[in-house]
Every structure is written in structure tokens, then in C-alpha cells.
């Protein structure tokens, strides 16, 4: 998954040039969160470019037209988060891509299912089938790859395989294929951001051409969630709105160029055990971007957030679009029938923001808030299974989840780190549709259980947004279905990237993660149109709730009943997630576990940094923040590598309830080497602004727990600087569990609200 | 059982344009890459560019850039080559070839392109 | 361009095994390459065998596998039989396109 960024950055390929197809992705993806409700923002599916091999063709040579670049996470070799200098994924040597490191972006990707794999076998249409995984619904519709936690679309699987990220550039860096993908299609960035200028690759002209003039561009890889299916070749966006294709930026794992990888082939960065089985899930009617196709991806939870860095969001549409990383499923898994709506809304995944520092426009006389608004997707439900009530009273403003094709969700699978085999399809497409009346309003994450890959859902809202439904895995223990509380499983595996895109070097200022369009095996971009304005009745209950599990019972009592301490300083706590030395690839996707040592937080850094699989940060991170009084403004996530992430293992959840948190020092947790996030041509990069989170007391940040910091604001704030959340990513958890002194926090800060009466 | 069918043999002139189809049927169209590769008599194959119906996502040989158009009809699960300003050297076999999982497992019957005065 | 070569042709006996080989020119095969091997029999009849080096396209024989052997792609039958005697053909992906080998004749008398 792109790694969120405070900077938009191009990642660019480490070769040079990944097979980047024509679809250019636009900026960072970014999630916005409605304040209503958290909305998806299409993880833009094109594929990583893959750099050159020595014995590569021509960079460029081939180019894609592709109207979606699948996501990054096609590159089976492990992307590194180079956009920031020094930001490397820790631990993770950077190693690049060589050619066809991606089967997606070699147009060979896995397909969400292995259903039409064996010769003579009829293949399953995933689509035709509607498949409840452990208490997860999935809509009918292709099975997704939700590798796209954020956004929609295997590969990932949520979307499509797409190419594996390519390392980022600093923006303007990145090297464009010129012979790579002819034009990328842009997400529907109207949807998004309305008025902001696309940047990305032509749409798609009739006849699926791609309109001339973004010929040669290069993909740019958008901050995106991978954790959407990345595995799945890019899905097609059919313009849902304004005609415009929406570009989901999932990333697959790594897998061959131009082939979907039917069978779940154990990379590195893939996932080891891709589920071959696919639920085919029917998309909700309505119009919405191509289906995503699920695609197999390991069980594991990996967190998306996706915050949209300086994109101005417009409070008093819940339509915004929350990129929402689909969870790397099983191709079987669809998208759990989120009492929360998963991001409804499609992330203009290829938006390009000039800058991509700059915000989106806001209408005028609206708020904008810059505040990255982080989903999480919440596994485990209400025990109705619907999530709290302003979660089904958002379904009702959710439309129902539109195809505007079968667009695969990508959840790309994601090559063990190093991996080079991009033949896995990491985010085959699968249709992840999110029942309508699951309310928008909180994303589920579900982490990942075990290295069985779940495959990723992404849901296409009826307005034509790209859903990615959350890998089946059952909700992290502990998580509750509450209302707009969103739990991110530390852990999630990032969902496999989309597949790898055409060689073309991302532009600059665009992320290569995704650089390359998506492969075909990457899902397209996919148009997510904001979800609808979910009700007010929402706000009332957005309060910024940090709710850290007590690890005991009896601790939980203790904590409330602890005086508070001052918070252990998190500063200079940098927990890199994605980082070698926090990432442990497993077998079965490459899992990531990040263990953070230091307690502090206020360093941390969260870059979802290996691009070419940090599509597959299904869930990864995503957390869902209302920004109210919650100050995150110096946190900076960076979902850079997503590959390794998908094994994030969802940890403890915890919840901060408190009102308003000062997280003092800086908190970026990197997560995220990319190596295998290969997956994810296509795969987005995420940018995340830091925002500082003060704890005034030192907590332990453990990535590899999977807290869920759930921001609820009373009221969602017109407030125009909503920085204070903006930035937040928490690929990692904090684990308030470990830390008596944050829980006692929390627990006062509850107190505190409940006296307030928030 | 998976199957491409690719349209018939195809006459052309020097300097029009045709367009080959390939209809896939028993798999989910949009879940693979469909390539297509050119075979000329006495010569091996040579890979033309991939299209990935879902998104429409398309990679080419940049031989063949500016020669062929991939596109496909989700509705009709079918993928299109059109080949503008043919001359001699474009008369061939094109397949159209599935890809996933890292194979190109099913491949069109081919169609024949005579480009000829 | 990337020039993949294999043997022209070879030629082997039932119940024995064979394997065909695929260089690039641009070095070593790797993984990376998603070495792609298709059969084709008379009349234009192409099936893929082997995908991303080892992986075995569903329904195909498990006699065939694929693997790398030093720096080339190589694909093993065993115990070969009269219905293999085809032209195998290779196929290299190189970051941006795909570059396919000459094809190799297998004759299996």
C-alpha cells in the first residue's frame, strides 16, 4: 500500500520503470473520512511499476492504456518507501523491482479465484455467489480482492493484482515509463475532491481507449490504501460519476505481469497461502465502478489508513471519500457485512493533487478539513452484526453499492518479501460489494486471522463507489460492533496489491507504488463516488473514543480505577512498520509483525512504506477518526510498504475514547516495507500527515497489535483545521493495554465525555 | 469449460484498419488478463499487449503501440484488437491468449489477418 | 530487445524425460521473468503449461514442471508420452513486454 505520506511523493520504481500501464495514478491516495461517515476513497489499482531487469525490454516498451492502473504490490520483489528521504522501510533493504517482478503488471496476475484455472474446469464466476465468511456478508459479486484496505479494489483483491509499488520518489522524481502505459485513467477525482483537477491519465475513451495525450504518461502511484485487493488485476472503473472511471488503487502482490496468478502462489510479499476458493459476491445494483474481484489473500489484517494529507474535506458531506484499504482476503471472502458501512465511498485514488500536498478543494462555505480521516475498518460487529445504531443509520445513506463493472476488489497477494515472483496475482479483481445497509458511517477492519488469505472485498457503493469488503477473518477478540468506533487490527496483512502496471516510471509527484496502470491483473482505478451524507445522527456520537481493552479484566478495572499517570513519552518512538526489523514474513502472505520496543509514540512514524504491497494493508491500520478535539496533527503514518504488512497480526485493539487526546510527539509508525507489497501495481501510496498525538503519558505502541483507535467526535466539527487528525495513520496499534497509564487516560477522557456529555 | 473463440479469418487492405474479437466463456472475464500475441508464418510469437477487462488496464508491446488497440465488452465478455493501417508485415495469426496465475493458460484458436491489394 | 532462445528441437522417447530450456539474453533467468511455457500442437492449438516459473496451469500433467536450472528457465517433462510431441514455446517477461523463444520441436518417438 502507498505508505501515507505528509507529502504526496511519487514512488517510483526502483528499477527505474516498472511495466506501468497507461493509467496514471494520481496523487497520494488518500482516505477521507466523512465526518458522518467514513467514506472510501478508491485505492487506485494499477499495477507497480516494475523496474527494468537487466534483462528487461525497453522501460516503457510496453505500454498500457489501461483505464485503472492496477495497484503496486504486483512487484514481487519488495518495495521500498523511498519517497522520504532516509524513509525507507527500515530493516528492509530496498531492493528493486526487477522486470516483471509482478505478475500483475506481466499481465499474469492472480485471478481473484482459482475457479477458472484448471483447464476444462468452468470457472466459478465469483460474482454469481454471495458468501458469508465468519460472520462476514459479502454482497453478491465477484469475489473482491481487497487488498485495497482504503480503497476499493485484489489487486485488492480488494482490487485487482496490480504491479507492485515501485520505491517512491520524492515528487517530480519519479521517472516516467515512456513507453509505458499509454494513458492511466483517472479515479473520478469529482467524486472525491469534486473540483480538483485530474492529473492522471486520460480516462477512458470510448472503446476503452484511453483518451490521447496521457499516452505516455507514467502511472502514478496515489497514496492508496493497499490494503484494498490488491491482488486483483485492476478493475475497470466505468465512470460511475462524471463519467469518470473510478481508479480503486489497490495493489496486488507481486504476480506475473499481465496474468491474474489463479492459484494463491506463496511469495514473499504474496501471500503464501492465497484462499483459492472465491466467494463469488454479487455487487449491489446501482451504478458503480467495475466489480472488484476479490482475489485470494492471506488472513492476515493489515491496517490501511489512509488520510488524506491536505485534502480539504467538506464536513458536512459524509460523501467524502475514505480511501478504504479492502482486507486481502481469501478470494471466498467478500467483504463482512459491515455494520459500519466499509468506506462506501470510492477514494479518487488518482486524484493528482499538484502537490498532492495540496487540499482538494472544498465547496465553498463548507469547512474544509484537511484531517486525514483514517479508516478503520471495524471486523467485528455490533452483536446485531450491523454495528452501532449511527452505523445502520448510515446504511441508510449509504447507496447501495453500484458495479460499474466487475471490478475485481483487489487484494493482491503479496510475494514473501524479496519475493520476485510476480506471477502471484496479489489482488485478483473481486466485487466487493458492501450491503447498502451497512452504514458507511464506520469502516469494520477485520484483521486477518492466521496467514489464510481472506480475500478482499471491495464494495461498490450504489453511487457507483468501490467498496472493499474486509477480509472475513473474524473480528479481532475483544472488538466490539460499536457505533462509528472503528477497530484496526495492529496486524492486519496488507491486503496483496493490484497488479502490476505497465513499465512506466511514475510521474513525479505520483507514487510509482501504483505507478504502473493497473495490469490487467490490477484493478483499475475504480470511481468512488462519496458516499452519501450519512445521517446526522452520527455526529452526535463522533467523540474521539480511545478505548484501550484491558488486557485483564481485572486490569480493566484497575485502569479506571488507576489515577492517571503521565503517559509514558512516546517520543522519539519510531516504530517502522514495514521496516525489516519490525516485519516477519510469514509464509502465508508475509506477514509483518511489528513489534514496537520503545513506548514511545511520539516518534513514531507509520509508513506503510513497501509499496509494492501496501495494497495489502487490508484494514491496516485504518483508523477512523472524527476529528474533533482529537489533536493528531503531527502524526504522520506512512503506509509506505504494505506487502509485509499484510501479516500485521491484529493485535490488541484499543480504543481511545477520550475526547481529546494530545499526542505531544510526533507518532509516525512506518509501516512497511514493500518489498512484497509488490503487489501492488496500482498500489497506492498512502499519505498520511502527521498530526501530533500528545500522550501525555508514555504508551507502548505495539504495531503488531491490532488497537483500533477509534476517534468519534460528537459533532462533526466545521472546523476547518482538522489537521489535528489529518494526519494520523495508525498502521501501527497503540496498545493501550500495555500502557495502564493511557488506559487510565482513556479512561478519564471517557470519564471526562461522559461528564460532558459527548 | 474455458474457452476463446476469436473471430474468423480476416481480408484486409494495406492501410485499413480490422478488429479481432475474442469471446471468452466459462470463467469470469474480467478476473484475467487477456493477451494477444502475433505468430507469423516461419517466425515465433510475438506478444502484442495485454488487456485486463476489468479495468480496462492495458499494456503493450511498444512495437506495437501505435499498431493495435486493446479493448474489451465486459458485457459481452469479449476482448478487441483493432489493428489500424495494416500493411503486409501485419498478416498473421493474432491469438488472444487468458492469463492469470501467472499462465497464459487458454489461448484463442487464432485468426488469421491477410493483409493484401 | 531481450532475445529468448531454446533449442529448436529435441527429441526424446516415451517414459523418458526431457527437459527444454529458455535463456534470455539479458542474463540469468529469474523469477521474475514469470517464465511462461505453452505448448502448441497442429492447427494453431496453444495450451499454457507453466506460469511464473514452476506453476502449473490447472489441468495440465503433472509430468510437466517448470523450474530454473542455472540461468535459464527450463521446462522438465517426465516420462514423456506421444501426445507431448508438440512445439514448446517460452516465454520471458522483461519488465514491460513479453518475448517469447523461437520454440523448441519436441518429437517424441
Known amino acids: 500500500m502507498a505508505e501515507p505520506r505528509q507529502e504526496f511523493e511519487v514512488m517510483e520504481d526502483h528499477a527505474g520503470t516498472y511495466g506501468l500501464g497507461d493509467r496514471k495514478d494520481q496523487g497520494g491516495y488518500t482516505m477521507h473520512q466523512d465526518q458522518e461517515g467514513d467514506t472510501d476513497a478508491g485505492l487506485k489499482e494499477s499495477p507497480l511499476q516494475t523496474p527494468t531487469e537487466d534483462g528487461s525490454e525497453e522501460p516503457g516498451s510496453e505500454t498500457s492504456d489501461a483505464k485503472s492502473t492496477p495497484t503496486a504490490e504486483d512487484v514481487t520483489a519488495p518495495l521500498v518507501d523511498e519517497g522520504a528521504p532516509g524513509k525507507q522501510a527500515a530493516a528492509q533493504p530496498h531492493t528493486e523491482i526487477p522486470e516483471g517482478t509482478t505478475a500483475e503488471e506481466a499481465g499474469i496476475g492472480d485471478t481473484p479465484s482459482l475457479e477458472d484455472e484448471a483447464a476444462g474446469h468452468v470457472t466459478q464466476e465469483p460474482e454469481s455467489g454471495k458468501v458469508v465468511q465468519e460472520g462476514f456478508l459479502r454482497e453478491p459479486g465477484p469475489p473482491g480482492l481487497s487488498h485495497q484496505l482504503m480503497s476499493g479494489m485484489p489487486g485488492a483483491p480488494l482490487l485487482p493484482e496490480g504491479p507492485r509499488e515501485a520505491t517512491r520518489q520524492p515528487s517530480g522524481t519519479g521517472p516516467e515509463d515512456t513507453e509505458g502505459g499509454r494513458h492511466a485513467p483517472e479515479l473520478l477525482k469529482h467524486q472525491l475532491l469534486g473540483d480538483l483537477h485530474q492529473e492522471g491519465p486520460p480516462l477512458k475513451g470510448a472503446g476503452g481507449k484511453e483518451r490521447p495525450g496521457s499516452k505516455e504518461e507514467v502511472d502514478e502511484d496515489r497514496d492508496v490504501d493497499e490494503s484494498s485487493p490488491q491482488d486483483s488485476p485492476p478493475s475497470k472503473a466505468s465512470p460511475a460519476q462524471d463519467g469518470r472511471p473510478p481508479q480503486t488503487a489497490a495493489r496486488e502482490a507481486t504476480s506475473i505481469p499481465g496474468f491474474p496468478a489463479e492459484g494463491a502462489i506463496p511469495l514473499p510479499v504474496d501471500f503464501l497461502s492465497k484462499v483459492s476458493t472465491e466467494i463469488p459476491a454479487s455487487e449491489p445494483d446501482g451504478p458503480s465502478v467495475g466489480r472488484a474481484k476479490g482475489q485470494d489473500a492471506p488472513l492476515e489484517f493489515t491496517f490501511h489508513v489512509e488520510i488524506t494529507p491536505n485534502v480539504q474535506k467538506e464536513q458536512a458531506h459524509s460523501e467524502e471519500h475514505l480511501g478504504r484499504a479492502a482486507f486481502p482476503g481469501a478470494p471466498g471472502e467478500g467483504p463482512e457485512a459491515r455494520g459500519p458501512s466499509l468506506g462506501e465511498d470510492t477514494k479518487e485514488a488518482d486524484l493528482p493533487e499538484p502537490s498532492e500536498k495540496q487540499p482538494a478543494a472544498a465547496p465553498r462555505g463548507k469547512p474544509v478539513s484537511r484531517v486525514p480521516q483514517l479508516k478503520a475498518r471495524m471486523v467485528s460487529k455490533s452483536k446485531d452484526g450491523t454495528g452501532s445504531d449511527d452505523k445502520k443509520a448510515k446504511t441508510s445513506t449509504r447507496s447501495s453499492a453500484k458495479t460499474l463493472k466487475n471490478r475485481p476488489c483487489l487484494s493482491p497477494k503479496h510475494p514473501t518479501p524479496g519475493s520476485s515472483d510476480p506471477l502471484i496475482q496479489p489482488s485478483s479483481p473481486a466485487v466487493c460489494p458492501e450491503p447498502p445497509s451497512s452504514p458507511k458511517y464506520v469502516s469494520s477492519v477485520t484483521s486477518r486471522t492466521g496467514s489464510s488469505g481472506a480475500k478482499e472485498m471491495k464494495l461498490k457503493g450504489a453511487d457507483g463507489k468501490t467498496k472493499i469488503a474486509t477480509p472475513r477473518g473474524a473480528a479481532p477478540p475483544g472488538q466490539k460492533g460499536q457505533a462509528n468506533a472503528t477497530r484496526i487490527p495492529a496486524k492486519t496483512p496488507p491486503a496483496p496489491k493490484t497488479p502490476p502496471s505497465s513499465g512506466e516510471p511514475p510521474k513525479s509527484g505520483d507514487r510509482s507504488g501504483y505507478s504502473s496502470p493497473g495490469s490487467p491483473g490490477t484493478p483499475g482505478s475504480r470511481s468512488r463516488t462519496p458516499s452519501l451524507p450519512t445521517p446526522p445522527t452520527r455526529e452526535p456520537k463522533k467523540v474521539a473514543v480511545v478505548r484501550t481493552p484491558p488486557k485483564s479484566p481485572s486490569s480493566a478495572k484497575s485502569r479506571l480505577q488507576t489515577a492517571p499517570v503521565p503517559m509514558p513519552d512516546l517520543k522519539n518512538v519510531k516504530s517502522k512498520i514495514g521496516s525489516t526489523e519490525n516485519l516477519k514474513h510469514q509464509p502465508g502472505g508475509g506477514k509483518v509483525q511489528i513489534i514496537n520496543k520503545k513506548l514511545d509514540l511520539s516518534n513514531v512514524q507509520s509508513k506503510c512504506g513497501s509499496k509494492d504491497n501496501i495494497k495489502h494493508v487490508p484494514g491496516g491500520g485504518s483508523v477512523q477518526i472524527v476529528y474533533k478535539p482529537v489533536d493528531l496533527s503531527k502524526v504522520t503514518s506512512k503506509c509506505g510498504s504494505l506487502g509485509n504488512i499484510h501479516h500485521k497480526p491484529g493485535g490488541g485493539q484499543v480504543e481511545v475514547k477520550s475526547e481529546k487526546l494530545d499526542f505531544k510527539d510526533r507518532v509516525q509508525s512506518k509501516i512497511g516495507s514493500l518489498d512484497n507489497i509488490t503487489h501492488v501495481p496500482g498500489g497506492g501510496n498512502k499519505k498520511i500527515e502527521t498530526h501530533k498525538l500528545t500522550f501525555r503519558e508514555n504508551a507502548k505502541a505495539k504495531t503488531d497489535h491490532g488497537a483500533e483507535i477509534v476517534y468519534k467526535s460528537p459533532v462533526v466539527s466545521g472546523d476547518t483545521s482538522p489537521r489535528h487528525l489529518s494526519n494520523v495513520s495508525s498502521t501501527g496499534s497503540i496498545d493501550m493495554v500495555d500502557s495502564p497509564q493511557l488506559a487510565t487516560l482513556a479512561d478519564e477522557v471517557s470519564a471526562s465525555l461522559a461528564k460532558q456529555g459527548l | 469449460q474455458v474457452q476463446l473463440q476469436q473471430s474468423g479469418t480476416e481480408l484486409a487492405k494495406p492501410g485499413a484498419s480490422v478488429k479481432l474479437s475474442c469471446k471468452a466463456s466459462?470463467?469470469?472475464?474480467?478476473?484475467?488478463?487477456m493477451h494477444w500475441i502475433k505468430q507469423r508464418p516461419g517466425q515465433g510469437l510475438e506478444w502484442i499487449g495485454y488487456?485486463?477487462?476489468?479495468?480496462?488496464?492495458?499494456k503493450y508491446n511498444q512495437n506495437f503501440r501505435d499498431k493495435a488497440t486493446l479493448t474489451a465488452d465486459e458485457s459481452s465478455n469479449s476482448a478487441y484488437m483493432q489493428l489500424n493501417s495494416l500493411t503486409y508485415e501485419d498478416s498473421a495469426v493474432y491469438y488472444c491468449?487468458?492469463?492469470?496465475?501467472?499462465?497464459?493458460?487458454?489461448w484463442g484458436q487464432g485468426t488469421t489477418l491477410t493483409v493484401s491489394s | 530487445q531481450a532475445v529468448v532462445t531454446q533449442e529448436s528441437a529435441l527429441t526424446t522417447s516415451p517414459g523418458e524425460t526431457v527437459t527444454l530450456t529458455c535463456r534470455s539474453s539479458?542474463?540469468?533467468?529469474?523469477?521474475?521473468?514469470?517464465a511462461n511455457w505453452v505448448q502448441e500442437k497442429p492447427d494453431h492449438l496453444f495450451t499454457g503449461l507453466i506460469g511464473?516459473?514452476?506453476n502449473r496451469a490447472p489441468g495440465v500433467p503433472a509430468r510437466f514442471s517448470g523450474s530454473l536450472i542455472g540461468d535459464k528457465a527450463a521446462l522438465t517433462i517426465t516420462g514423456a508420452q506421444t501426445e507431448d510431441e508438440a512445439i514448446y514455446f517460452c516465454a520471458l517477461w522483461y519488465s514491460n513486454l513479453w518475448v517469447f523463444g523461437g520454440g523448441t520441436k519436441l518429437t517424441v518417438l
Open positions: 466459462g470463467y469470469t472475464f474480467t478476473h484475467y488478463w
Open positions: 491468449a487468458r492469463a492469470g496465475n501467472r499462465v497464459f493458460d487458454f
Open positions: 488487456i485486463y477487462p476489468t479495468n480496462d488496464y492495458t
Open positions: 539479458t542474463g540469468a533467468v529469474t523469477t521474475s521473468n514469470f
Open positions: 511464473g516459473t514452476n
